[in-house]
Each structure stands twice: as structure tokens, then as C-alpha cells.
């Protein structure tokens, strides 16, 4: 750092004073010197380092009429809003000719009530769940002791015995306020008061109780909610989308979910209006007067297949001698699953019904036994899925084939040998 030489007497006639105060204080340090000839620029040092961006003003007053006469030079350094970084030893420095002169030092000190660097923040926590709060304060003067308060009651009786910068709370069962007090030799400062809101714990063990093609019954175990009873639980279901895929912890579904509210208890809900044979993801959250719990992870579930809701359409049945030609179209009503095939039944007056599994074909040629003279022959068709048969169509009478009518061309289906019968 620059040092004055002793070859000449110091030009300083006034040195910086001392300032000690609390944070935010505004103060001024002042240097005065008397020089002969052109007045020099006064620089300020803090702890031996030149302050490049000092808020200083310099006033120069001539003591005579000639430029070579003496001048009084006053430099004032303004400190606005005193901070810890402003503290230290201050000196003025001038260059006169080939010599450097520094004033006697003045000192700037910071001393006041504790100042918070960190204060506890508002937050929500699940009931009976551990969490931490932070508080940090500094002087000077040091030491600074911290006292934590919960609902305005001190949590310890002595510094060194209670928690300091971090408070570990093993769990709460009611919404509470926390603050910390910082004590030093100047007194006490109180932090902001943080409100810790106690929410219900996340529900557990979300599971299926029963499945129907268009509804699922689900149940769960509620988490603890402290002193606040649960008011309701909310269940969300969303169609699974393999393209996007709901991750176990993904906070939001890829599409608008189907939302249902359940009064509690019981912690059970029937979700209706679902699509059969469809994968869903479901999750649940429970709410008290303080707010909702976090959602459970998404649980993959699937509605089972149902039977087709309607019979095959546009059934036509014609007869040509000992052959009958039957064809139909897929049901217009929802299949509620994967179509596995069709069943066909035909029956004549006074004859037993014959049942056949046609598979996925939508037309069949029947080889009728006997001379085909049976009267009032009717045909019914039903579609089926893994869940079972859908409704049968209304009986369609077998009409005699007229020349010019189209005739299906495919493999003939002999009537089953068992049970065997023939029309007279």
C-alpha cells in the first residue's frame, strides 16, 4: 500500500474521524490539507487499497491571489447505508511532486442489532412429517445467539442448548408459526413469522376393489391429517397413453382427467362412465380444512372386456334346396372388447336348435340335412368377445332363393354331426 515519506512534513491538517453505527447509517469522513501551488487530487484508501468508485467530493479554496500561493483542500467521503463491507481503516492519499502522503487513519465500524441473513419461510408440510427451518443472523457485535419460537413460545431456554441456524422439527399435527430471535450485545431482533401449514399425508395403498367394463371400484388408506379431519378425497382417472406414458411421479396427466370426489369415510369410490377394455391411470389426494395432500403416484388399472352391446346388423338368410346362405355385418353397438367371432343358431318349427361357432367370418353356407322341406326355418346371430356373447339378433326367416339372387361362394359348412337330426 502507498506510504508517505518523511522527507517533507505531511500536508494534512485534518484527518478522518471514526464512525461506528448500525446498518443503514449514513456518515461522512473528512480530510483537510494545505498545499502550495496547484491543488492535488485527493484519493481515499480503505485498508490500504485505493477506492476507485468512492462517493467523494473535493473542495479547494485559495489562500492568496496567486496560483502559487497556498490552497486549502477538503475531501469528503460519503458512506450511504453502512454495510459490513464498508468497515475498515480509512485514509486520504495525495501525490505531491515525487512524494506520496497519507493521512492518519480513521475507522468505520458496524455495531447494532443483529441482522438477518436468512429467515424462516412459509411452507406446507404433511402431518407428522419431519422438516427443517433455517435462520441466520450476524452482528457485529458478535456473538449472535438464536432462539427459535413456536407459536410464540421459546423452544429452548439457553443459547448453546437450543438449535441454532437450522431447526429440525420432527413433525406437527397442527398448523403452527415459527420465528427466531437473534440476540447480541445491542439487543434483540425478531425474524419474520413463518406459517407452517399442516396438510394431510399422502394416501397409501390405492388399489382396485372390483372391476366392471365401465366402472372401477377403488379404495385407499388415508394418511394422518393431524387435528384436522379429512373433508373429502379426490380421485382422478386418465386414459393411459402409451405414446406419452404417465411416469410414476409425473405431477400432471397428459390430458384432462376425469375427476370424482368421495365423501369420507369410507375411503372407497366407484368410478363410472369408463370405457371397457381400456387402460387408465388413477391417483387420489385427500383434503382437510388446511388444504389437500399430495397426490399418490399414478396407478395403472384396466377395465375388463364386456360383451358386445348389440347384435350383428343386416342379417340376410336365403335357402336353395339343401343349402342355406347367411350373411351379416359387425354390430354397430360398442363391442366392449376384442371381437372373437360370431355364433349362429338356426331352428325349424318342431326341431331342436342348432348352435354353431362361425369364427370371424361374416357369412356362411349351411348344408342342411334332409330334403329341406322343414317349415319356418329361422336364423339368429350373436357376436362375442372374451367376456361372452352379446345379444342375439331377432330371428330371421330363411327365404327361398330366387334365380338372379347372389349366392355366396365359399366353403360349405356341414351341419354338425352331433347333435344329428334331419327334417322329415
Amino acid at each position: 500500500a502507498p506510504r508517505g515519506t518523511q522527507a517533507e512534513e505531511s500536508p494534512f491538517v485534518g484527518n478522518p474521524g471514526n464512525i461506528t453505527g448500525a446498518r443503514g447509517l449514513t456518515g461522512t469522513l473528512r480530510c483537510q490539507l494545505q498545499v502550495q501551488g496547484e491543488p492535488p487530487e485527493v484519493h481515499w484508501l480503505r485498508d490500504g487499497q485505493i477506492l476507485e468508485l468512492a462517493d467523494s467530493t473535493q473542495t479547494q479554496v485559495p489562500l492568496g491571489e496567486d496560483e502559487q500561493d497556498d490552497w486549502i483542500v477538503v475531501s469528503q467521503l460519503r458512506i450511504t447505508s453502512l454495510q459490513l463491507s464498508d468497515t475498515g481503516q480509512y485514509q486520504c492519499l495525495v501525490f505531491l511532486g515525487h512524494q506520496t502522503f497519507v493521512s492518519q487513519p480513521g475507522y468505520v465500524g458496524l455495531e447494532g442489532l443483529p441482522y438477518f441473513l436468512e429467515e424462516p419461510e412459509d411452507r406446507t408440510v404433511a402431518a407428522n412429517t419431519p422438516f427443517n427451518l433455517s435462520c441466520q443472523a450476524q452482528g457485529p457485535p458478535e456473538p449472535v445467539d438464536l432462539l427459535w419460537l413456536q407459536d410464540a413460545v421459546p423452544l429452548a431456554t439457553a443459547p448453546g442448548h437450543g438449535p441454532q441456524r437450522s431447526l429440525h422439527v420432527p413433525g406437527l399435527n397442527k398448523t403452527s408459526s415459527f420465528s427466531c430471535e437473534a440476540h447480541n450485545a445491542k439487543g434483540v431482533t425478531t425474524s419474520r413469522t413463518a406459517t407452517i401449514t399442516v396438510l394431510p399425508q399422502q394416501p397409501r395403498n390405492l388399489h382396485l376393489v372390483s372391476r366392471q367394463p365401465t366402472e372401477l371400484e377403488v379404495a385407499w388408506t388415508p394418511g394422518l391429517s393431524g387435528i384436522y379431519p379429512l373433508t373429502h378425497c379426490t380421485l382422478q382417472a386418465v386414459l393411459s397413453d402409451d405414446g406419452m406414458g404417465i411416469q410414476a411421479g409425473e405431477p400432471d396427466p397428459p390430458e384432462e382427467p376425469l375427476t370424482s370426489q368421495a365423501s369420507v369415510p369410507p375411503h372407497q369410490l366407484r368410478l363410472g362412465s369408463l370405457h371397457p377394455h381400456t387402460p387408465y391411470h388413477i391417483r387420489v389426494a385427500c383434503t382437510s380444512s388446511q388444504g389437500p395432500s399430495s397426490w399418490t403416484h399414478w396407478l395403472p388399472v384396466e377395465t375388463p372386456e364386456g360383451v358386445p352391446l348389440g347384435p350383428p346388423e343386416n342379417i340376410s338368410a336365403t335357402r336353395n334346396g339343401s343349402q342355406a346362405f347367411v350373411h351379416w355385418q359387425e354390430p354397430r353397438a360398442p363391442l366392449q372388447g376384442t371381437l372373437l367371432g360370431y355364433r349362429l343358431a338356426y331352428q325349424g318349427q318342431d326341431t331342436p336348435e342348432v348352435l354353431m361357432d362361425i369364427g370371424l367370418r361374416q357369412e356362411v353356407t349351411l348344408e342342411l340335412q334332409g330334403d329341406g322341406s322343414v317349415s319356418n326355418l329361422t336364423v339368429c346371430v350373436a357376436a362375442y368377445t372374451a367376456a361372452g356373447d352379446g345379444p342375439w339378433s331377432l330371428p330371421v326367416p330363411l327365404e327361398a332363393w330366387r334365380p338372379g339372387q347372389a349366392q355366396p361362394v365359399h366353403q360349405l359348412v356341414k351341419e354338425p354331426s352331433t347333435p344329428a337330426f334331419s327334417w322329415p
Partner: antibody, heavy 118, light 107 residues
Framework: DVQLQESGPDLVKPSQSLSLTCTVT?????????WHWIRQFPGNKLEWMGY???????NYNPSLKSRISITRDTSKNQFFLQLNSVTTEDTATYYC???????????WGQGTSVTVSS | DVQITQSPSYLAASPGETITINCRAS??????LAWYQEKPGKTNKLLIY???TLQSGIPSRFSGSGSGTDFTLTISSLEPEDFAMYYC?????????FGGGTKLEIK
């Protein structure tokens, strides 16, 4: 149980130094708390004099700052008051106490009466 | 320094009565006021700190209230052992300062 006991001379001559000892039992003065001296003048007026913090730092009443010193001997679990240049105005009952944080004082000694007289 | 004015300086009451003692600070001391009981031959007893926090082991008939500059100590349903000297003290800033005291005597 925590106990504090003051000891020292009953009589001190003006311009001399007053020295008192506070012996603490049942608690280590380096563990926690601030350890104070308070005095009560005839007529019951109480004056806080200063403390020594468990860390060793001190804080004094500005009205006494030029005359007061509080020190400790951690091996004996004692802390001390020295008041220099006493006058008859320093005649009082002197108490040592422990403060709850930098709060109020939760344990006091019985007090020791000191008269400044020639 | 913060000046503390305590009133009344003398109070006579009967067992079973409720009494109040007041302290006024010369400037705001937030909530940081303590109350002590002094009895001959006994060590001073801390009753209340931070304006209204009851010190451990003190009966609930003692209560404190107030903040800023005006504070009150209330003793409800006086017991014979409550007749003593009472002092208030601010612990908001140093130097700590005390009220002049209130002597509570049996009527």
C-alpha cells in the same frame, strides 16, 4: 439445581477498587447463558451493570464502562466484578444472576452488601 | 437509555383479590419486558418474560400483557405468599433497565 453465590468485602474505601466473586454451582458458565452483575441501591433502585457471555465476550452499562471489568475463571466456574475508583454512590447490594438467553434473569444470587466509606 | 416508569409504588390488597401493576417504557420495547418478585431472605424470582411468557414453575394466577410501551402484571386471586416487592425490567436493548418497584402489602 443451579445456585449462584456472591462473595467479597463488606467495606471498601473511596477511590479504591471493589472486587466481587460469583461462584456458580450446578451449571457450567461456559456451556450457555449470560452471567450478569446487578446492583440495588438503598431505596431499592436496581441497575444492570454488565455481563460475561458464555463465549467470553462482555457487555457493560455505558454509565460504568470506564470503571467496570467482568472476567471469569472457568476452572473454578466463577466470574468476577471489578469496579474501579469507587465513591459512596457505589454503596449497594450487589447481585450476580444468570439470564435466560439475552432475556430476563432466571437465577439470582442472594446478594452481598457493599458499603463505600472511609 | 430506556426509562421504565412503574406504578403504583405501593399497593395494599386482600387475599383473593385481583391486582394489576403497570410499567411504561420511554420508547417502544416491542414485547420484551420481564417481571420479578423480591422477598426478604429469598433470591429474586423471575415471573414473566417477553411480556407474557410465564416462567416455568410460576403459578398461572400470574399473567403479563402489553407490548410497545405499556405493560401490565396481573395477579388474580391473591395468595398470602404473593405479598412482596415486584419489579419490571426491559430486555429489548442494552443497557437493561428496571422499574422503580411496587410494594404489595396485605390490607
Amino acid at each position: 439445581d443451579v445456585q449462584l453465590q456472591e462473595s467479597g468485602p463488606d467495606l471498601v474505601k473511596p477511590s479504591q477498587s471493589l472486587s466481587l466473586t460469583c461462584t456458580v454451582t450446578g451449571y457450567s458458565i461456559t456451556s450457555a447463558y449470560s452471567w450478569h452483575w446487578i446492583r440495588q441501591f438503598p431505596g431499592n433502585k436496581l441497575e444492570w451493570m454488565g455481563y460475561i457471555h458464555y463465549s467470553g465476550s462482555t457487555n457493560y452499562n455505558p454509565s460504568l464502562k470506564s470503571r467496570i471489568s467482568i472476567t471469569r475463571d472457568t476452572s473454578k466456574n466463577q466470574f468476577f466484578l471489578q469496579l474501579n475508583s469507587v465513591t459512596t454512590e457505589d454503596t449497594a447490594t450487589y447481585y450476580c444472576a444468570r439470564s435466560l438467553w439475552f432475556y430476563a434473569m432466571d437465577y439470582w444470587g442472594q446478594g452481598t452488601s457493599v458499603t463505600v466509606s472511609s | 437509555d430506556v426509562q421504565i416508569t412503574q406504578s403504583p409504588s405501593y399497593l395494599a390488597a386482600s387475599p383473593g383479590e385481583t391486582i394489576t401493576i403497570n410499567c411504561r417504557a420511554s420508547k417502544s420495547i416491542s414485547k420484551y419486558l420481564a417481571w420479578y418478585q423480591e422477598k426478604p431472605g429469598k433470591t429474586n424470582k423471575l415471573l414473566i418474560y417477553s411480556g407474557s411468557t410465564l416462567q416455568s414453575g410460576i403459578p398461572s394466577r400470574f399473567s403479563g400483557s402489553g407490548s410497545g410501551t405499556d405493560f401490565t402484571l396481573t395477579i388474580s386471586s391473591l395468595e398470602p405468599e404473593d405479598f412482596a416487592m415486584y419489579y419490571c425490567q426491559q430486555h429489548n436493548e442494552y443497557p437493561w433497565t428496571f422499574g422503580g418497584g411496587t410494594k404489595l402489602e396485605i390490607k
